[in-house]
Amino acid sequence: SCNTATCVTHRLAGLLSRSGGVVKDNFVPTNVGSEAF
């Protein structure tokens, strides 16, 4: 899957949306590697 910074950001946004924003505070694009997905 796509591991560019932009892909990671969009993937995380989708995850946050689906979870209702209930995630750890440090779960942000610059802290999350592609392996998190």
């Epitope: 796509c2 560019t4 932009t6 892909c7 950001t9 969009h10 946004a13 942000v28 610059t30």
Partner: antibody
Framework: EVQLVQSGAEVKKPGASVKVSCKAS????????MNWVRQAPGQRLEWIGD????????NYNQKFKGRATLTVDKSASTAYMELSSLRSEDTAVYYC????????????WGQGTTVTVSS | DIQMTQSPSSLSASVGDRVTITCKAS??????VAWFQQKPGKSPKALIY???YRYSGVPSRFSGSGSGTDFTLTISSLQPEDFATYYC?????????FGGGTKVEIK
């Protein structure tokens, strides 16, 4: 309100360097990657590279590798793009841009900085 | 580098027209494509990400579709404020690359 405010226009001579700044506000600067893009007159947009403001990691377009340097000052929430060994073809508008999720999911762009390279 | 080829390079249309702009990638980019609108002397404005998702605040008349190598931006009913240049971008691979732009002019 998310804002990316860039430094003012620059006129440089061939061979010189230029450093463009991008001051971020309205969001957590270190949470999101910062991209740099340029547009020469009448040309398509061209991606220069991105930087992770949290860790300082960078990705560069090979076309600019060795000439472009991306840095950040976390304490000032400011990103910088330095381009060295300038030539006339580097005359362009330079933009910073960042895709933010919180507070608003959007791809924000700075207002652009015009860099003119002329002898 | 992945080449993004946009067509047409320019088009003339009237208010109310349906406008379709296409973008072809030189290799598979899945759905990792964005579309931008740019007016003269202004910064690009993001419209679409992940090929078909509108950013908040983008009018519903803008829609995107496609996957793999072929992508489309459609404006269902052109408005006066839509006359601008439109660019596609792939972000599936580094370096990110943009199409050459499509200038939408008033007929």
């Amino acid at each position: 309100e998310v804002q990316l405010v860039q430094s003012g226009a620059e006129v440089k001579k061939p061979g010189a360097s230029v450093k463009v700044s991008c001051k971020a506000s309205g969001y957590t600067f270190t949470d999101y990657y910062m991209n740099w893009v340029r547009q020469a007159p009448g040309q398509r947009l061209e991606w220069i590279g991105d930087i992770n403001p949290n860790q300082g990691g960078t990705n560069y377009n090979q076309k600019f590798k060795g000439r472009a340097t991306l840095t950040v000052d976390k304490s000032a929430s400011t990103a910088y793009m330095e381009l060295s060994s300038l030539r006339s073809e580097d005359t362009a508008v330079y933009y910073c841009a960042s895709i933010i999720i919180v507070p608003n999911y959007f791809d924000y762009w700075g207002q652009g900085t015009t860099v003119t390279v002329s002898s | 580098d992945i080449q993004m080829t946009q067509s047409p390079s320019s088009l003339s249309a009237s208010v109310g027209d349906r406008v379709t702009i296409t973008c072809k990638a030189s290799q598979n980019v899945d759905t990792n494509v964005a579309w931008f609108q740019q007016k003269p002397g202004k910064s690009p404005k993001a419209l679409i990400y992940s090929a078909s998702y509108r950013y908040s605040g983008v009018p519903s008349r803008f829609s995107g579709s496609g996957s793999g190598t072929d992508f489309t931006l459609t404006i269902s009913s052109l408005q006066p404020e839509d006359f601008a240049t439109y660019y596609c971008q792939q972000y599936n691979n580094y370096p990110y690359t943009f199409g050459g732009g499509t200038k939408v002019e008033i007929k």
